[in-house]
Interface confidence: low
């Protein structure tokens, strides 16, 4: 039927026009935001940061490697981003949180225990989809079993308790390169976000059979980018707005 075909084409065209319009508005909004950012930073043009520079600056961990490989940073294309977003669907965003210094952290041999994390206001307890703690374990010389413990520091109790367990796990490591290990910390993170005063930090331990700690907590020489960090995936369901 010629009429219905024509009608269908008009509808398709209408949808495409809406798509194009929507894409154009989105692009112009992004451009406007970029101009504002550049003016705040007193810059005329966007800095040209290569993938290699970013590789050096960011932790050398699997989730970040994947992100860098997935998106060519040099390609300034608004359709490629680490946010999947439009005004009608939930957006998910991955936030990488690096440890910071804290007054709360207990001192051991004059240096603070790792780690304390401060959270961006973007991270709200009911919006956390996933939270992984990533730790790097130094290479071993012989095949060995490693016992990993993640402890949450708490205010000392009457019986001397200063921490409570998040997770303990056993890993078999072979000689060669070190490994990145991730631990699910979603529940702990949600508790911290509900009660920020309970966030006194965590302690990371990864001992081999001889009692040597393999976890990189305070990177030494040649250990740049091997700090522990939190990978948090948050979701945001925006209110459906009329244009």
């Amino acid at each position: 039927n010629e009429n219905s075909e024509q009608k269908e084409n008009v509808e398709k065209e209408g949808l495409c026009n809406a798509c194009t319009w929507r894409q154009n508005t989105k692009s112009s909004r992004i451009e406007a935001i970029k101009i504002q950012i550049l003016s705040k930073l007193r810059l005329e043009t966007a800095p040209n940061i290569s993938k290699d520079v970013i590789r050096q600056l960011l932790p050398k961990a699997p989730p970040l490697r994947e992100l860098i490989d997935q998106y060519d940073v040099q390609r300034d294309d608004s359709s490629d981003g680490s946010l999947e977003d439009d005004d009608y669907h939930a957006t998910t965003e991955t936030i990488i949180t690096m440890p910071t210094e804290s007054d709360f952290l207990m001192q051991v041999d004059g240096k603070p225990k790792c780690c304390f994390f401060k959270f961006s206001s973007k991270i709200q307890y009911n919006k956390v989809v996933k939270a992984q703690l990533w730790i790097y374990l130094r290479p071993v010389e012989t095949p060995t079993t490693v016992f990993v413990q993640i402890l949450r520091l708490i205010k000392p109790m009457k019986d001397g308790t200063r921490y409570t367990g998040i997770r303990s796990l056993k890993l078999d490591m072979n000689p060669g390169t070190g490994i990145w290990q991730s631990i699910d910390v979603k529940t702990v993170l949600q508790n911290w976000l509900k009660q920020p005063e309970s966030n006194l930090g965590i302690e990371i331990k990864a001992l081999d059979e001889n009692g040597h700690d393999l976890a990189v907590t305070f990177p030494g020489p040649g250990e740049d980018g091997l700090n522990p960090f939190l990978e948090v995936k948050v979701t945001d369901t925006p209110k459906r707005s009329r244009r």
Partner: antibody
Framework: QVQLVQSGAEVKKPGASVKVSCKVS????????IHWVRQAPGKGLEWMGG????????IYAQKFQGRVTMTEDTSTDTAYMELSSLKSEDTAVYYC????????????WGQGTMVTVSS | DIQMTQSPSSVSASVGDRVTITCRAS??????LAWYQQKPGKAPKLLIY???DLLSGVPSRFSGSGSGTDFTLTISSLQPEDFANYYC????????FGGGTKVEIK
């Protein structure tokens, strides 16, 4: 193979103190944590406290705080547990046990030391 | 203080039976839980740590499960040498033991 060897049985009077030793052999003592657990006749296991052989830092169960002292001598790879103001209810077998680190299960145990408190 | 409650306090069983012992923590202890076997006049022996990891050399008929507050020790097919006392223990921070379970011959 790591072994923990404890001192022999003791008989004490109420109000006295007892010091039990636990010698570690076959391993790096300084990387261990030594805990003390006691068991009264026909009863269950009761954790008393622990000491880090590396730092000498201690943690005691609330019940024994002020009455128990745990120490170590790294030159002889020996840990000690001293319990003061003994009462008849302190009659028990006292065990030392090794943990690989602060929060670990006790994988190696001493043979136990019987302490009898009697007037 | 976190309390560890073990049940039952005793169980009568025959060789070949499947035996299940449970342990409940009064608060979340993640998987920082161990199971021990103790025979009369002997020191306890570690069987399972991290709630489900079998210590090397322990027969595979022993298994552990659970996380958080509820834990289980299972002996799939009881052997004559398994008649003993069993204790659970939380070992995070200040350790503490459950009251024990005596596995005796029916």
């Amino acid at each position: 193979q790591v072994q923990l060897v404890q001192s022999g049985a003791e008989v004490k009077k109420p109000g006295a103190s007892v010091k039990v030793s636990c010698k570690v052999s076959g391993g790096t003592f300084s990387t261990f944590h030594i805990h003390w657990v006691r068991q009264a006749p026909g009863k269950g296991l009761e954790w008393m406290g622990g000491i880090s052989a590396y730092s000498g830092s201690t943690i005691y169960a609330q019940k024994f705080q002020g009455r128990v002292t745990m120490t170590e001598d790294t030159s002889t790879d020996t840990a000690y547990m001293e319990l003061s103001s003994l009462k008849s209810e302190d009659t028990a077998v006292y065990y030392c046990a090794r943990a690989r680190y602060v929060d670990d299960a006790f994988d190696i145990w001493g043979q136990g030391t019987m302490v009898t408190v009697s007037s | 203080d976190i309390q560890m409650t073990q049940s039952p306090s005793s169980v009568s069983a025959s060789v070949g039976d499947r035996v299940t012992i449970t342990c409940r923590a009064s608060e979340d202890i993640s998987n920082f839980l161990a199971w021990y076997q103790q025979k009369p006049g002997k020191a306890p022996k570690l069987l399972i740590y991290a709630a489900s990891d079998l210590l090397s050399g322990v027969p595979s008929r022993f298994s552990g499960s659970g996380s958080g507050t509820d834990f289980t020790l299972t002996i799939s097919s009881l052997q004559p040498e398994d008649f003993a006392n069993y204790y659970c223990q939380k070992y995070i921070s200040a350790p503490s033991f459950g009251g024990g379970t005596k596995v005796e011959i029916k």
